[in-house]
Amino acid sequence: SGVFQLQLQEFINERGVLASGRPCEPGCRTFFRVCLKHFQAVVSPGPCTFGTVSTPVLGTNSFAVRDDSSGGGRNPLQLPFNFTWPGTFSLIIEAWHAPGDDLRPEALPPDALISKIAIQGSLAVGQNWLLDEQTSTLTRLRYSYRVICSDNYYGDNCSRLCKKRNDHFGHYVCQPDGNLSCLPGWTGEYCQQPICLSGCHEQNGYCSKPAECLCRPGWQGRLCNECIPHNGCRHGTCSTPWQCTCDEGWGGLFCDQDLNYCTHHSPCKNGATCSNSGQRSYTCTCRPGYTGVDCELELSECDSNPCRNGGSCKDQEDGYHCLCPPGYYGLHCEHSTLSCADSPCFNGGSCRERNQGANYACECPPNFTGSNCEKKVDRCTSNPCANGGQCLNRGPSRMCRCRPGFTGTYCELHVSDCARNPCAHGGTCHDLENGLMCTCPAGFSGRRCEVRTSIDACASSPCFNRATCYTDLSTDTFVCNCPYGFVGSRCEFPVGLPPSFPW
């Protein structure tokens, strides 16, 4: 759509005559009729296919035509068209004499024609005014013309419609050729797509207005480049959303199970060596002189009654010392200076000489022991402590120090490993001779029912349009991460695309 503009500049008819040669009375009151039509190889009579326009009387005989455009007048003459400008045309301009005030063709005598021109022209849109002059023997007409596009039409043929806008359908102005020029912060074919904050992650972030960065489900951070780990993840990280990849030393679905109790809690005392032996489980290897689950008890070296032949034991900083009774000597009072003649056997023991009387041996009655039958039988010698328990003499009584997992006077009772409820996710615990066993509910497996084996919510590919699916392990549901241009819980709805011309 555009306008052919014709500017009449000067008409000369010095003799004031008609085309027939007859003079006008009193002078030639001149007006013009203009016919614009398609280009013809030979200009020929016929309909004015591009339009017609007439002027009022502009002057008498010879006159210059005032440029009236600024005052809303009719020079230049406007011939609007509603089609693609073809670039070529035929133009016919007739100058007529108006004897009266009625300028209609049917009201004028045929011989009222003063002059007529007919040209073939070529004219590009937006070209400067093209000046032309047509002369006959009696008249001369000077005029110029040009073609401009109507508002919102652009291009070489005024065929490109473009209307600047700044709304939901686009944010742009129009270039001279009709192409869109996006306003700052917008991009895309129709400048509908905001340019997000610089660095905003292409897939995980999006924006609804320029310089914004909104995160898709499962992502966080200023640029949406940090994943959100599984809800409840304690000592873990993620590389994709809803993951919980445990830090070293932690295990379980939420990385809340301590697999490195030794490092995290240092339970072994007195320089003992700690060994991890499972979730929240450890073993302390004590240094000499210490005992107890955590090697917290200092062990008296006299507890093992190392002194023989009635020697008395004294604890010392770096060990112990035996005080031997008369007739005995040695580290443990194990050597005798006595013979059977000295009646060395107590408690009814009978003496037997050895090594030609240089030594002796006592044969003790039941319940007595020792090289001189001086000791009642040690209650610990019969290993009364079951399950590897340690037997300790405590004067007239004895006690068993049990290994972890056992209890009772003789460590004969198995401490229930199930007492700590080690089976996750409602698993049933069974005590065994050497540990425990978990029977897991449907959907879980592993030694402690810690591994989720439920049907992956993403297995059915519920997300559309190449969206990424993430399983929310805490709820057994899925989350769809939509690509640009799609919305909906399953990314099933395309964001409405504009028609060819969205205005």
């Epitope: 013809q40 190889a41 030979v42 200009v43 020929s44 009579p45 016929g46 070529t88 035929s90 016919i92 007529k116 021109i117 007919a118 040209i119 073939q120 022209g121 070529s122 032309d132 047509q134 002369t135 006959s136 023997t137």
Partner: antibody
Framework: EVQLVESGGGVVQPGRSLRLSCAAS????????MYWVRQAPGKGLEWVAF????????YYRDSVKGRFTISRDNSKNTLYLQMNSLRAEDTAVYYC???????????WGQGTMVTVSS | EIVMTQSPATLSVSPGERATLSCRAS??????LAWYQKKPGQSPRLLIY???RLQDGVPARFSGSGSGTEYTLTISSLQSEDFAVYFC?????????FGQGTKLEIK
């Protein structure tokens, strides 16, 4: 009296050039589009080239495109046809004409003979 | 290009009789058609333009009609000077194209 007088015709060898002129008088030459039309011996009329009144538009028939050039000098009231790379099939009587049926104008010259022969 | 087809190629008519010449265009030429008379050694002479308009100075026995693609030249009462070759010419689009001609001869 309206007159169009062609000149410049003659016998020429194939591949050579000729320049035809058409001198106009008796009408306002600069107002009208001008045409060259030819008639080969024993054949019909055939349009050759066109130039608009101001010289801004030119058209040629396909067989002469790139070889012939139409031009005009409105100050001399003269139309030209520069013919290069002439061929035997260009042999014809060449007429210049002013045609504007909207204005009832139809002026023809008497023609000039061009013979292309080795 | 627009092809102009004239018929008949030759027409034999007696003086005083009516002659009807036909010209068909390969596409609509919107009445932008002229009829020319051509005699040997002479320039073409315009008889009719815009399909039906008589050129100044041409006798009224010549008339033209038609529209779209079909056009007719009628000579109502043939005179001896009318025996010649007649060409139609379309002026609608370039290239300008003439019909191949109809030779009007005395019967």
């Amino acid at each position: 009296e309206v007159q169009l007088v062609e000149s410049g015709g003659g016998v020429v060898q194939p591949g050579r050039s000729l320049r035809l002129s058409c001198a106009a008088s008796g009408f306002t030459f600069s107002n009208y589009g001008m045409y060259w039309v030819r008639q080969a011996p024993g054949k019909g009329l055939e349009w050759v080239a066109f130039i608009s009144h101001g010289g801004g538009i030119t058209y040629y028939r396909d067989s002469v495109k790139g070889r012939f050039t139409i031009s005009r000098d409105n100050s001399k009231n003269t139309l030209y046809l520069q013919m290069n790379s002439l061929r035997a099939e260009d042999t014809a009587v060449y007429y210049c004409a002013a045609l504007n049926w909207e204005l009832g104008i139809d002026y023809w010259g008497q023609g000039t003979m061009v013979t292309v022969s080795s | 290009e627009i092809v102009m087809t004239q018929s008949p190629a030759t027409l034999s008519v007696s003086p005083g009789e009516r002659a009807t010449l036909s010209c068909r265009a390969s596409e609509d030429i919107y009445s932008n058609l002229a009829w020319y008379q051509k005699k040997p050694g002479q320039s073409p002479r315009l008889l009719i333009y815009a399909a039906n308009r008589l050129q100044d100075g041409v006798p009224a026995r010549f008339s033209g009609s038609g529209s779209g693609t079909e056009y007719t030249l009628t000579i109502s009462s043939l005179q001896s000077e009318d025996f010649a070759v007649y060409f139609c010419l379309q002026g609608s689009k370039f290239p300008l194209t003439f019909g191949q001609g109809t030779k009007l001869e005395i019967k």
